[in-house]
């Protein structure tokens, strides 16, 4: 899943998502997350896994919304 690269490193929150993952990431693998920039042409929630991979996901997907709600509350 591609995100726009940044001179500040691969996980800088100004990245934009162009495609989304087609699979549900296991919750226990997620270490961190952020929302892509409001100026991006497509929405995106980027989950960062414990292995350091950043994965673009669609905020409209229910599992993404569930994960965000869970992480916000905990």
């Amino acid at each position: 899943t591609k995100t726009e690269s940044s001179s500040r490193g691969p996980y800088h929150p100004s990245e934009c998502c162009f495609t989304y993952t087609t699979y549900k990431i296991p919750r226990q693998r997620i270490m961190d997350y952020y929302e892509t920039n409001s100026q991006c042409s497509k929405p995106g929630i980027v989950f960062i896994t414990k292995r350091g991979h950043s994965v673009c996901t669609n905020p409209s997907d229910k599992w993404v919304q569930d994960y965000i709600k869970d992480m916000k509350e905990n």
Epitope: P13, S14, Y33, Y34, E35, T36, N37, S38, Q39, P43, I45, P59, S60, Q65, I68, K69, M71, K72
Partner: antibody, heavy 122, light 108 residues
């Protein structure tokens, strides 16, 4: 013309419960978010809760508001805020506000009611 | 929770002058930021959203900028009617929707 109007503000004693009501006119509750925001006398704005997501009715609460405040959609044009165990610190003007939903989440608040005053005092 | 810190708490300027208000989030909010204006005895009014987009009917004298965790509201060609308190708010999906503490603008 869109508008929101709050009601239910009152003078109550500490420990009491109170329900505030927000009625919308010309406002699409199903495609927008509804927020409750409060402002203590002479102080800043403090968000309490919001309800969004159309039929799914997702809700979010400020950390401090969880458990004591409940936001609910009671009809196609009405949203309520139930408040329990009120204290002096809850004395404020309570605003109902309409917010845009962008990319599945509530964003900016573009429509505000005039507010309703809640006073908690013994 | 994301903490929104506004500076200064109060600022004074003359008619025709310029005022700059800063809003700093405790972590990046990816330009998901709104600015509101509140006059005494009135509800707040949306000025700017997505950090830099003017709300409908808001004059271009109001300008929002910034990214990451740091944002600025600049009001140029100040008018008496701009005397108010200004608030920023985080609107990102992944954090709480907290407001800044507010900045009072006094126009002389």
């Amino acid at each position: 013309c869109q508008s929101l109007e709050e009601s239910g503000g009152d003078l109550v004693k500490p420990g009491a419960s109170l329900t505030l009501t927000c009625i919308g006119s010309g406002f699409d509750f199903s495609s927008n978010a509804i927020w409750w925001v409060r402002q203590a006398p002479g102080k800043g704005l403090e968000w309490i809760a919001c309800l969004y997501g159309g039929t799914s009715g997702s809700t979010e609460y400020a950390t401090w508001a969880k458990g004591r405040f409940t936001i609910s959609k009671t009809s196609s044009t009405t949203v309520t805020l139930q408040m329990t165990s009120l204290t002096d610190a809850d004395t404020a003007t309570y605003y109902c506000a309409g917010g845009v939903v962008t990319w599945s989440y509530p964003r900016q608040l573009y429509l505000w009611g005039q507010g309703t005053l809640v006073t908690v005092s013994s | 929770d994301v903490v929104m810190t506004q500076t200064p708490a109060s600022v004074s300027a003359v008619v025709g002058g310029t005022v700059t208000i800063k809003c700093q989030a405790s972590q990046s909010i990816s330009s998901w930021l709104s600015w509101y204006q509140q006059k005494l005895g009135q509800p707040p009014k949306l000025l700017i959203y997505s950090a830099s987009t003017l709300a409908s009917g808001v004059p271009s004298r109001f300008k929002g900028s910034g990214s990451g965790a740091d944002y600025t509201l600049t009001i140029s060609d100040l008018e008496c009617a701009d005397a108010a308190t200004y608030y920023c708010q985080s609107n990102t999906a992944v954090h709480t929707y907290n407001f800044g503490g507010g900045t009072e603008v006094v126009v002389k």
